[in-house]
């Protein structure tokens, strides 16, 4: 099933236009912005979601120390170029012919250059560290309960297999979720960790991408887990290439 047949909507992506014009009158959904057909039985790629977002109206200690090569998405929103599979193209350029290379989650991994800049391949982000700070609670959450609930959330809401949730670290009030997925581990049909992390990030911000599904209601043994800040670090299979100028 690519979409809910009865009312022809896309359960996994509200930023779509759906109509019963598929084969045999089946419901078919296309992403806003790109017009690309999307599979509504799984998460839509982050590239297509960002493109749709840009086209939409604007009103719309056990802890891990991120490695020196970890990237944070400081550039924010941009209108990306996506390939026919919906993945980010390795090279992204803006309207003023400023170009840069991105990784598989669309985060810049080189200095900005001009149209002569070459990005030979799309470098895979194989390790994502989601750093959360939760609001004060009566007491600390039980670590194993928290671990189990977060794995269940990623499995049931984002369809990410628990084997890709490498670890859940907790030192009140900081929670860190490590997602790991090498190219060799990702089988056909597996949700990409970058897409799962993006859906999670939007859920945490109260901007759910799901159609007609309630917002994120995360509870650990009945106690609500409310997040007050999120930081996401991205680690690529090949370290990023920035000049020393950026690092000073």
């Amino acid at each position: 099933h690519t979409a809910a047949q009865d009312n022809c909507t896309c359960p996994t992506n509200k930023m779509t236009v759906c109509s019963p014009d598929g084969p045999g009158g089946r419901c078919q959904c296309r992403a806003l912005g790109s017009g690309m057909a999307v599979d509504c039985s799984t998460l839509t790629s982050k590239c297509l979601l960002l493109k749709a977002r840009m086209s939409a109206p604007k009103n719309a200690r056990t802890l891990v120390r991120p490695s020196e090569h970890a990237l944070v998405d400081n550039d924010g929103l941009y209108d990306p170029d996506c390939d026919p599979e919906g993945r980010f193209k390795a090279r992204q350029c803006n309207q003023t012919s400023v170009c840069w290379c991105v990784n598989s989650v669309g985060v810049r991994r080189t200095d900005k250059g001009d149209l002569s800049l070459r990005c030979d391949e799309l470098v895979r982000t194989h390790h994502i560290l989601i750093d959360l700070r939760h609001r004060p609670t009566a007491g600390a959450f039980n670590h194993s309960d928290l671990d189990a609930e977060l794995r269940r959330l990623f499995r049931e809401r984002y369809r990410l297999h628990p084997k890709f949730v490498a670890a859940v670290h907790y030192e009140q009030p900081t929670i860190q979720i490590e997602l790991r997925q090498n190219t060799s581990q990702k089988a056909a049909g597996d949700v990409d960790i970058g897409d799962a992390a993006y859906y999670f990030e939007r859920d945490i911000k109260g901007e759910s991408l799901f159609q007609g599904r309630g917002g994120l209601d995360l509870r650990v043994r009945g106690e609500p887990l409310q997040v007050e800040r999120t930081l996401i670090y991205y680690l690529d299979e090949i370290p990023p290439k920035f000049s020393m100028k950026r690092l000073t």
Partner: antibody, heavy 120, light 110 residues
Amino acid sequence: QEQLKESGGGLVQPGGSLKLSCKASGFDFNNYGVSWVRQAPGKGLEWIAYIYPAFHNTYYATWVNGRFTISSHNAQNTLYLQLNSLTAADTATYFCARDAGSVDYNFNLWGPGTLVTVSS
Amino acid sequence: DVVMTQTPASVEVAVGGTVTIKCQASKNIDSNLAWYQQKPGQPPKQLIYAASTLASGVSSRFSGSGYGAEFTLTISGVECADAATYYCQQALTIGNVDNPFGGGSEVVVK
């Protein structure tokens, strides 16, 4: 050949305890989740608990209320279910069932079951 | 809590006939539904997963359909060996769940 085999069932008095085992063979325990499901004589299937052994994540049916505990010994490819404060209503065949290794919870491999009888 | 309701509880069918069993979920479960066959003294055997995908080694006389909250198991060209109890199971969530299985449907072959 992939197999599950339960053991540890038998006759137990009301209020007593029992520990059931489920031995897995022919596959790597760590790549799957496993459930305990029970069936009272002449009744339907009732899910009890689920464990993802690789991370020791455990989940229980709402009615369990701490009476039962699921656990695993990964090196021995063995799953356990500790049954406490047993009553006659717990008389059933107890099955262990493995998920298919996908993101949903469908069970494609079942053991033959072990019978637990609670009676004085 | 997702509750699964199965109908009918029992159905009689002649050899060669067709039987339909329905399963209703109390909430939308997309296509996360499995069907099992159980014969007396045996463990359940998976027939269908993802609402309509036939499990390995299962006869194509069995078919599943549905999406969201309404699902159907159809057995066509019924054989004596199909006499069993059939269970549906929501395979979406194990959080705050009483029982993911439906109550069962007994198929009696005449």
